[in-house]
Interface confidence: low
Amino acid sequence: LMGGQDKPFLSARPSTVVPRGGHVALQCHYRRGFNNFMLYKEDRSHVPIFHGRIFQESFIMGPVTPAHAGTYRCRGSRPHSLTGWSAPSNPLVIMVTGNHRKPSLLAHPGPLLKSGETVILQCWSDVAFEHFFLHREGISEDPSRLVGQAHDGVSKANFSIGPLMPVLAGTYRCYGSVPHSPYQLSAPSDPLDIVITGLYEKPSLSAQPGPTVQAGENVTLSCSSWSSYDIYHLSREGEAHERRLRAVPKVNRTFQADFPLGPATHGGTYRCFGSFRALPCVWSNSSDPLLVSVTGNPSSSWPSPTEPSSKSGICRHLH
């Protein structure tokens, strides 16, 4: 992580993207350690901020305001040099969020993708954003930035992500910024979970009492595998939401989850996927599709005995 020969390396934890009112730790890494350092902002690289205060190891900045947004550098302590300080570090951009209304984030063709595919994440807003930023949760690097297209009516930007591999799966948010204040970002979009499938062997999906049932009869779908999946995800064709349950080890050494669907009203095509706790956004191949048919008089769409999980939250652990 070292900079050039006499350049420290400035980094931000947990991220360079900081919510208004939040805190960020700035660390200046110099000569194989965190020494005393001074901070500089924007192009005023000769004038240290915070009244020339010297920091040790890290400086926790906050609660941040829009005025904290901008480019920072540090100089590490170098007692035997003429100035006593190193050359300036790499520039580090701190972006402060929550300054405009949130944009919307969509995935094309959808948030559930096969390994190796490419997804377009489209960030759009009816606010006249000049730039859009895309950020993946848990990543400390700068977010990707694109110039917004179109005019004031609807601004949008298309971020191409791929070819998809496990490291790119996760929770994404996008932000917008208006002209003249490029590092003062909007509130974050609602989170969007990008899930990669096809990485592990497919589970099997079965229905109890069977795939063809009478209207009103209780149906349970069982997803199982010899693989030690932690979580199973059940999706129904045409529905945006998936349900998920913890896998339970069975005496026959399989790992299984039983999804109670309640009294049958409408049929549908179901698939299930397995995933591991360590990589909640990386799923197995899909099970073979299971068509559940209902005989008799269907009345309304299938009730949900448990709330289906929301559009996001897939990439969070099941506690």
């Epitope: 209304r101 949130k102 807003s125 606010v127 179109a150 009516g153 609807v154």
Partner: antibody, heavy 115, light 107 residues
Framework: QIQLVQSGPELKNPGETVKISCKAS????????MNWVKQAPGKGLKWMGW????????TYADDFKGRFAFSLETSASTAYLQINNLKNEDTATYFC????????WGQGTLVTVST | DIKMTQSPSSMYASLGERVTITCKAS??????LSWFQLKPGKSPKTLIY???RLVDGVPSRFSGSGSGQDFSLTISSLECEDMGIYYC?????????FGGGTTLEIK
């Protein structure tokens, strides 16, 4: 559910001022811009502009710059359209509609300008 | 400004008939197009957004298609309650612009 409720019909003389309200409910008011649309008798729909409900910044179509003003009372989740120095050609039904693709509409407010 | 040309301006159709209304933009508007239904004395009703996405609660006999400059609204099997005036709207660029409208009446 999402609703936009507009104020009642107005009968005005030329030169007067009218202020129409549009009260929103069922969603977070500041999450969607509010559009205003005009429909003159026997004519089609015409987009007048929109107001950013988060910042309060209005944007007007060219034909509606000058005498027309959009405003907000965010605490009451209400948007307003004010027309100053009314002319006969302002006789129309005015609609508020929220979101970038005008997803939900108010019931419309008929403004009649007549001597 | 982007000009939206809607056709036909009026039409008669029979119940159960398949009806298509078209809208042409003077320049590429991607898929940023909505369709609305207007009935006398009622609020306009949004049917379709993003060219082909059906608004919740709108009957599935309505569908939208197209991208770029050419768009259409189709009613697969006309019902009595479908009579009214239909408008398209581009929201790709300011100012937003509506088509001239299509009056749909039952034969």
């Amino acid at each position: 559910q999402i609703q936009l409720v507009q104020s009642g019909p107005e009968l005005k003389n030329p030169g007067e001022t009218v202020k129409i309200s549009c009260k929103a409910s069922g969603y977070i008011f500041t999450n969607y811009g509010m559009n205003w649309v005009k429909q003159a008798p026997g004519k089609g729909l015409k987009w007048m502009g929109w107001i950013n409900t988060y910042t309060g910044e209005p944007t007007y179509a060219d034909d509606f710059k000058g005498r027309f003003a959009f405003s907000l009372e965010t605490s009451a989740s209400t948007a307003y359209l004010q027309i100053n120095n009314l002319k006969n050609e302002d006789t129309a039904t005015y609609f508020c509609a929220h979101g970038p693709w005008l997803a939900y509409w108010g019931q419309g407010t008929l403004v009649t300008v007549s001597t | 400004d982007i000009k939206m040309t809607q056709s036909p301006s009026s039409m008669y159709a029979s119940l159960g008939e398949r009806v298509t209304i078209t809208c042409k933009a003077s320049q590429d508007i991607n898929s940023y197009l909505s369709w609305f239904q207007l009935k006398p004395g009622k609020s306009p009703k949004t049917l379709i957004y993003r060219a082909n996405r059906l608004v919740d609660g709108v009957p599935s006999r309505f569908s939208g298609s197209g991208s770029g400059q050419d768009f259409s609204l189709t009613i697969s099997s006309l019902e009595c309650e479908d009579m009214g005036i239909y408008y398209c709207l581009q929201y790709d660029e300011l100012p937003y612009t509506f088509g001239g409208g299509t009056t749909l009446e039952i034969k």
